[in-house]
Interface confidence: low
């Protein structure tokens, strides 16, 4: 029977800069029941706080609700693992909420085949930003990426859409059924998961772009 091994805070993510969650990996348990606590202070302060919510993020997590999230402050945090034989501490992790945002996927992806009379046909897609993100505040610039592939193909074709919430693609294989997905990321932060796939059937008379 030994003291617990050193835990590691391996990930912190925020969906919207207003709340965030951090997760840790336990070290070895030393063969005894082990209790974990996360303590933190905001940089420039000496007073320590304990994690406000160990429940919301699931096992081995600490969730910081809206009230505990300061966007312009760096959090310095550490996890303490304790059993009857002793304690061990993770390394300190410095977290700036601005840099850990991972939004939810974009919403309402719609895809249409457009066949204007005077121009080549194209695939037109549009989507909405995730609801948790308030773009009006100016705190966010969201960038988007689209991927699509014929249903039975292995490889995805990826297009960067910048800040647009709509996009046109001209080069497609007639008669194929395509899967289309979109994801987003803030200017500083992480890509969201891909949105659920939207399917679109390309007509057999769709004219390939020269």
């Amino acid at each position: 029977q030994l003291p617990p091994g050193k835990p590691e805070i391996f990930k912190c993510r925020s969906p919207n800069k207003e709340t965030f969650t951090c997760w840790w990996r336990p070290g070895t348990d030393g063969g005894l029941p082990t209790n974990y606590s996360l303590t933190y202070h905001r940089e420039g302060e000496t007073l320590m706080h304990e994690c406000p919510d160990y429940i919301t993020g699931g096992p081995n997590s600490c969730h910081f609700g809206k009230q505990y999230t300061s966007m312009w402050r760096t959090y310095v945090m550490m996890v303490n693992a304790t059993n009857q034989m002793g304690s061990s501490f993770s390394d300190e992790l410095y977290v700036d909420v601005t840099y850990i945002v991972q939004p939810d996927p974009p919403l309402e992806l719609t895809v249409e085949v457009k066949q204007p009379e005077d121009r080549k046909p194209y695939l037109w897609m549009k989507w909405s930003p995730p609801t948790l993100i308030d773009l009006k505040t100016g705190w966010f610039t969201l960038l988007y990426e689209i991927r699509l592939k014929p249903e039975k193909a292995a490889e995805w074709e990826t297009h960067f859409a910048g800040q647009q919430t709509e996009f046109k693609i001209l080069s497609l294989h007639p008669g194929q059924k395509y899967l289309v997905q979109v994801r987003c990321k803030p200017d500083h932060g992480y890509w969201s998961a891909w949105s659920p796939a939207t399917f679109i059937q390309i007509p057999s008379d769709f004219i390939m772009n020269d």
Epitope: S37, E50, Y68, M71, W72
Partner: antibody, heavy 117, light 107 residues
């Protein structure tokens, strides 16, 4: 409904120790949140003194750190304030309050404490 | 510590009036300012936090704005029950600090 109620002696002599208790009903102080003491001086100014969190950790205002202790009795769902070496400058209305993430969403009615010989 | 200056120290107004109270911080506190209402015989009431977030159960006639060092609490149409003492509190830095209060009186 969460309710907080302060209790204490009302009068303390200079250099003695002030002891106040806050009884919480409608919520367990070990479930969540931090449980604070705040005082209001006769001129109406408010000062945050410190807290004890649901886990038992404490934070104190640096201006009081050498004199203050906040503790709790979980069996009675109470937390307490001790302030050593009081002077007339500690005369105030003392409030207990629940910390809703750096702000205070539930307060007690307050108890008046006079330091006088 | 962050100093909070609240103005005016007292204000006379009539029911139905729109009034604005001000708090100024001695340094940048971003959006992290709260407002409370104090009435005799009642417990203090949290109105607004994070500058503009209305606490649950607070009427929409109360609103907060500002960031950095300058903040305002606006009551759009005063009701008789709004005549009270109002305090602001910064919640960006330790230790938490409060303004000296504004007494809102019936004209």
């Amino acid at each position: 409904q969460v309710q907080l109620q302060e209790s204490g002696p009302g009068l303390v002599k200079p250099s003695q120790t002030l002891s106040l208790t806050c009884t919480v009903s409608g919520y367990s102080i070990t479930s969540d949140y931090a449980w604070n003491w705040i005082r209001q001086f006769p001129g109406k100014g408010l000062e945050w003194m410190g807290y004890i969190s649901y886990s038992g950790s404490t934070s104190y205002n640096p201006s009081l750190k050498s004199r203050i202790t906040i503790s709790r009795d979980t069996s009675k769902n109470q937390f307490s304030l001790q302030l050593n070496s009081v002077t007339a400058a500690d005369t105030a209305v003392y409030f207990c309050a629940r910390d809703y993430g750096y702000v205070f969403d539930y307060w007690g009615q307050g108890t008046t404490l006079t330091v006088s010989s | 510590d962050v100093q909070i200056t609240q103005s005016p120290s007292s204000l006379s107004a009539s029911p139905g009036d729109r009034i604005t109270l001000t708090c100024r911080a001695s340094k940048n506190i971003y959006k992290y300012l709260a407002w409370y209402q104090e009435k005799p015989g009642k417990t203090n009431n949290l109105l607004i936090y994070s500058g503009s977030t209305l606490h649950s159960g607070i009427p929409s006639r109360f609103s907060g704005s500002g960031s950095g060092t300058d903040f305002t609490l606006t009551i759009s149409s005063l009701q008789p029950e709004d005549f009270a003492m109002y305090y602001c509190q910064q919640h960006n830095d330790y230790p938490y600090t409060f303004g000296q209060g504004t007494k809102l009186e019936i004209k």
